[in-house]
């Protein structure tokens, strides 16, 4: 079987994650995203930092980035709404809402994902699914097809150890283990899904991947329910 996916994961079952989005810049994959409403995709604010004059679009219904697939469709972005408190030099509030130019055509391969509204930490050890088209090995190879990996949630105290993220993990962030299996470059903005519900969004900080002492950092969507609702309203 193929190895070294996402980092240490494997190729996802095609179209089994109908909420998965590829945020694209000038026709190339930039970041992950997650369809949270018919016309809205949630991603990471830092993803658009370098997008100044480029054309941002959202690909839905895709498994392969390059191959034709009946369910695939590229949507223009009507409006990009980064969280008002997101800043280039911090991982805090790293959320972005993209309004599609029209409502997505829903079907088996395109479907919004319910997101967590109850502001309570996911229990440490819970296995959560993260998926994306980010790099898959230490060479930096980028995959054509969607990859995924199951990661255990890591408690905040451990994640905040001096040897780990040294106090940077606020109550609005969560961590997942990163020992060889991890999200990595290009997975930013993608979903961390626990029990079929969106719990986190991959932050787009420039983090070393696959090192157990540098756990993956995810923005807790429940902590931003009010902001998400206000934008989607």
């Amino acid at each position: 079987p193929p190895r070294g996916r996402i980092l240490g994961g494997r190729e996802a079952e095609a179209h089994a994650r109908p909420y998965m989005a590829s945020v694209q810049l000038n026709g190339a994959h930039l970041c992950g995203g997650v369809l949270v409403a018919e016309q809205w995709v949630l991603s990471a604010a830092h993803c658009l930092e370098d997008a100044a004059d480029g054309k941002v679009q959202v690909l839905l219904g895709a498994h392969s980035l390059s191959q034709p697939e009946p369910s695939k469709r590229l949507y223009d972005v009507l409006r990009a709404v980064p969280h008002p408190d997101s800043q280039p030099d911090t991982i805090d509030h790293d959320l972005l809402l993209l309004q599609l130019s029209e409502k997505a055509t829903l079907g088996p391969a395109v479907r919004p994902l319910p997101w967590q509204r109850v502001d309570r930490d996911v229990a440490p050890g819970t296995l959560c699914d993260v998926a994306g088209w980010g790099i898959v090995n230490h060479a930096g190879r980028r995959p054509d097809s969607l990859q995924h990996v199951l990661l255990p949630v890591l408690d905040r105290a451990t994640c905040n150890r001096r040897t780990h993220h040294d106090g940077a993990i606020t109550e609005r962030l969560m961590c997942a283990e990163s020992n060889r299996r991890d999200s990595c470059k290009g997975d930013s903005g993608g979903p961390l899904v626990c029990g079929g519900v969106l719990e986190g969004v991959v932050t787009s900080g420039s983090r070393v991947c696959g090192n157990r002492k540098k756990p993956g950092i995810y923005t807790r969507v429940a902590s931003y329910a009010a902001w998400i609702d206000s934008v989607l309203a």
Partner: antibody
Framework: EVQLQQSGPELVKAGASVKMSCTAS????????MHWVKQRPEQGLAWIGR????????KYDPKFQGKATITADTSSNTAYLQLSSLTSDDTAVYYC??????WGQGTSVTVSS | QIVLTQSPEIMSASPGEKVTMTCSAR?????MYWYQQKPGSSPRLLIY???NLASGVPVRFSGSGSGTSYSLTISRMETEDAATYYC?????????FGSGTKLEIK
């Protein structure tokens, strides 16, 4: 089209330093890792190290630690390799590669005494 | 560091012949890359993650293996396949190369 354009050949004196460049087109170097590989005349390949241009994180083969310095400038989409205290053992062709799938044409370095 | 030993060092094959070369690791690795290099040219990626064909590589090339033993096979040798072939492990820093197998045309 993805391309990696490396700087031209270098003839340098023993003990000196040299810095070569690798400019990418058709992709953003921040999106992957940039590696450097050494090949001495009539010999095999040796992995020197790699840089993650997005955060400056670098990994070297310990054999090249202190000899090689890898850097990147994301504004010009360019990776660099600097070699210091050159000896005849550093006479080689140096390749840059993105994710090991796209390769530059190589920069020939000749160290003269 | 992980030492990779390629064998044979030199081999020759006739057009149409099946060719297999091996790469053995001193300790277990999780996946292997294979490259082709012709004189005066840059290396070219052939196989990534042990068995996946890189873009534009003819389907006569294939890779297999696990643990400490990996191989590259050319199902039917063609004259343009005369080159030196290198394996490289991507499991453990530093990411070492094998010493190469030189394939000549008979």
């Amino acid at each position: 089209e993805v391309q990696l354009q490396q700087s031209g050949p270098e003839l340098v004196k023993a003990g000196a330093s040299v810095k070569m460049s690798c400019t990418a087109s058709g992709f953003n170097i921040k999106d992957t890792y940039m590696h450097w590989v050494k090949q001495r005349p009539e010999q095999g390949l040796a992995w020197i190290g790699r840089i993650d241009p997005a955060n400056g994180n670098i990994k070297y083969d310990p054999k090249f630690q202190g000899k090689a310095t890898i850097t990147a400038d994301t504004s010009s989409n360019t990776a660099y390799l600097q070699l210091s205290s050159l000896t005849s053992d550093d006479t080689a062709v140096y390749y840059c590669t993105s994710a090991m799938d796209y390769w530059g044409q190589g920069t020939s370095v000749t160290v003269s005494s | 560091q992980i030492v990779l030993t390629q064998s044979p060092e030199i081999m020759s094959a006739s057009p149409g012949e099946k060719v297999t070369m091996t790469c053995s690791a001193r300790s277990s690795v999780s996946y292997m890359y294979w490259y082709q290099q012709k004189p005066g040219s840059s290396p070219r990626l052939l196989i990534y993650d042990t068995s996946n064909l890189a873009s534009g590589v003819p389907v006569r090339f294939s890779g297999s293996g696990s643990g400490t033993s990996y191989s590259l096979t050319i199902s039917r040798m063609e004259t343009e396949d005369a080159a030196t072939y290198y394996c490289q492990q991507w499991s453990t820093y530093p990411f070492t190369f094998g010493s190469g197998t030189k394939l000549e045309i008979k």
